[in-house]
């Protein structure tokens, strides 16, 4: 009898533990933001990309905030940040201003409390895209593990924004919390 009660209690405790774990997991912040193709800046200079989707297609956000083109951290923690940026050009869309390109992405952290900005990750390459080639494509993927505090903001800068691939599976960035700060 008492053995049976103990087993039942353990099952109940276990389910509560599962529930607690699950609710904690559900509260884990994450974001996957995809490029808003209707609002990509033109030109070849380095610009901050401010238009991203957070609630359509592959884009999702939970317990983080997207505002003014920046992904805002709501919970302190260690986060994995990632960005994938694709550049492409087809001759039917126009000419290239120059065949020598620097195709870059910068993932930047801005702190509001102590006004400062830091590049967390950068990636890219110099490329020769001949005007005689019909099609060009180049992809950059960066990812890293960072301690982030509530209120800090993550933004993306790129060179040659007019060459961005506007598909949701091509140009995106995101973050997810991996663990608390001890």
């Amino acid at each position: 009898g008492s053995q049976h009660i103990r087993a039942e209690k353990a099952m109940v405790d276990g389910s509560w533990l599962d529930l607690a774990k699950r609710s904690k997991l559900e509260a884990q912040p994450f974001a996957h933001l995809t490029i808003n193709a209707t609002d990509i800046p033109s030109g070849s200079h380095k610009v901050s990309l401010s238009s991203w989707y957070h609630d359509r297609g592959w884009a999702k956000i939970s317990n983080m905030t997207f505002s003014n083109g920046k992904l805002i951290v709501n919970q302190d923690g260690f986060y994995y940040l990632y960005a994938n940026i694709c550049f492409r050009h087809h001759e039917t869309s126009g000419d290239l201003a120059t065949e020598y390109l620097q195709l870059m992405v910068y993932v930047t952290k801005t702190s509001i409390k102590i006004p400062s900005s830091h590049t967390l990750m950068k990636g890219g390459s110099t490329k020769y895209w001949s005007g005689n080639s019909e099609f060009h494509f180049y992809s950059i993927n960066v990812g890293g593990f960072f301690k982030l505090r509530s209120g800090e903001e993550i933004s993306i800068e790129v060179s040659n924004p007019s060459l961005l691939d506007p598909d949701q599976d091509a140009t995106y960035f995101g973050a997810f919390k991996v663990r608390d700060i001890d």
Epitope: S42, E91, T92, G94, D95, A97, T98, N132, E134
Partner: antibody, heavy 118, light 111 residues
């Protein structure tokens, strides 16, 4: 549809300068090189150079480097070619032109006749 | 600079007959698997008109009697059955390399 509208005929004296214009419409002006071509009366076609109106990059045939200056006004979607130190050799029809969506010069202005005469 | 030499300089062809114009480049105009050679027709007092792009592609709206062939340095424009309206001067042009260049032209007369 793509259209290139060029300025009217010019009569100039030797040693003077002229500035020809080419107003583009029907496409995004800043995304294609705009080319200039010269044709002397009864002669063939000569490629002068081109301008990329976005950042204003230019390229010229060596022969025209000191003769022609290419500029563009993005806000007016207009390209310009200034010809300086005019001589009788510069009397010609000048065309502005743009490549097609694939290749080859598919779009041409109507041409501007420049006559250099004392 | 790439020099384009057209031949013949002038050509007289009877209505309904075939006309063939040649264009030879001083060096190859091929790159990335394509030939950067184009053909134009120009009538007196008019701007040139693109007929063939990338050596063999017929520009939209151009009659199918016009065709282009060739690669690297040797190219040909063919009019399969000449019509009266084809009387004009024909030019080849390369844009494989700056500066772009034109051939000297071939004047086609209809007999």
């Amino acid at each position: 549809q793509v259209q290139l509208q060029q300025s009217g005929a010019e009569l100039a004296s030797p040693g003077a300068s002229v500035k020809l214009s080419c107003k583009a419409s029907g496409y995004t002006f800043t995304t294609y090189w705009l080319q200039w071509v010269k044709q002397r009366p009864g002669q063939g076609l000569e490629w002068i150079g081109a301008i990329y109106p976005g950042p204003g990059n230019t390229k010229y045939t060596q022969k025209f480097k000191d003769k022609a200056t290419l500029t563009a006004d993005k806000s007016a979607s207009t390209a310009y070619m200034q010809l300086n130190s005019l001589t009788s050799e510069d009397s010609a029809v000048y065309y502005c032109a743009r490549r097609g969506s694939r290749r080859g010069i598919a779009y041409w202005g109507q041409g501007t006749l420049v006559t250099v005469s004392a | 600079n790439i020099v384009l030499t057209q031949s013949p300089a002038s050509l007289s062809v009877s209505l309904g007959q075939r006309a063939t114009i040649s264009c030879r480049a001083s060096e190859s105009v091929d790159s990335y698997g394509r030939s950067f050679m184009h053909w134009y027709q120009q009538k007196p007092g008019q701007a040139p008109k693109l007929l063939i792009y990338l050596a063999s592609n017929l520009e939209s709206g151009v009659p199918s009697r016009f065709s282009g062939s060739g690669s690297r340095t040797d190219f040909t424009l063919t009019i399969s059955a000449v019509e009266a309206e084809d009387a004009a001067t024909y030019y080849c042009q390369q844009d494989n390399e700056d500066p772009y260049t034109f051939g000297g032209g071939t004047k086609l007369e209809i007999k």
